[in-house]
Amino acid sequence: AVNGTSQFTCFYNSRANISCVWSQDGALQDTSCQVHAWPDRRRWNQTCELLPVSQASWACNLILGAPDSQKLTTVDIVTLRVLCREGVRWRVMAIQDFKPFENLRLMAPISLQVVHVETHRCNISWEISQASHYFERHLEFEARTLSPGHTWEEAPLLTLKQKQEWICLETLTPDTQYEFQVRVKPLQGEFTTWSPWSQPLAFRTKPAALGKDT
């Protein structure tokens, strides 16, 4: 077995992608390794080559089919193996049974756009990408707005506890540049985690009308 300094972590995007990270202290950077996926009730299997992302970690994406195809369900179990080449042979480094819908991480929301902007408020919409129809409306969102002179980490989180693909930002400052991001998470899954943040959407509030108190 592999020692305790090794980690093998994978997430399913709910459609046709399993992303994996394998880390092992002391492993050689030029070692050739791959992840092999064997579903328990499917006729296909899939392999991806682990590529270095840092000194001691490697990552790859198991592409299971067309981006919007539903390749796995809530009853599937996928056996994932890390294999590394040792001379002419492949050595199994780790074996994990993986329940896809217990390990969800969706793609970042896309198509962010300003629907309407005023001096003090802005209405923004977005879309979810490659999300399973199984979720129906069982999704939640987090959003954050970057104000001038602040960092993303300082931005307060706004939580939307339902599948609502829009937000109305209030109490904004007139004639000010802002940026906005959103992320999504299904409600189900033991290890389900937030998607990456969306690409930031830049917008500017309208200037206050001269001589008027707005």
Partner: nanobody, 127 residues
């Protein structure tokens, strides 16, 4: 805390199958990660498999070669070890264990990570 009782061991011919069960009582089963270990005569206790509290991830020893499947039923307070294509080298006492601390299912735990142990069940594979 939970008490663990294993069952399902016995004598089986090489190539055969066994299903071990580990029944938990006296605690909240779903708050424990569960593991299986084995100890052959004259050898150290060896990790076999470990599953997370909800069963979303399960790690297996490389030595199992994909022949074993660990699963849990939180409604029945039971964890299972299905062993197929058994070999004489699988002969050992098999122990069920519970871990009170959080287990992510992304690494191989050590026996010292587990706090509660069953009494074991003997598995003998004849050639």
């Amino acid at each position: 805390e939970v008490q663990l009782v294993e069952s399902g061991g016995g004598l089986v011919q090489a190539g055969g199958s066994l299903r071990l069960s580990c029944a938990a009582s006296g605690g909240t089963f779903s708050s424990y990660a569960m593991g299986w270990f084995r100890q052959a005569p004259g050898k150290e206790r060896e990790f076999v498999a470990a599953t997370t509290r909800g069963g979303g991830r399960t790690m297996y020893a490389v030595s199992t070669e994909g022949r074993f499947t660990c699963s849990r039923d939180n409604a029945k307070n039971t964890v299972y070890l299905q062993m197929n294509s058994l070999k004489p080298k699988d002969t050992a006492i098999y122990y069920c264990a519970a871990m009170t601390s959080y287990y992510s299912g992304t690494y191989y735990p050590d026996s010292s990570d587990f706090d509660i142990w069953g009494q074991g069940t003997q598995v003998t594979v004849s050639s």
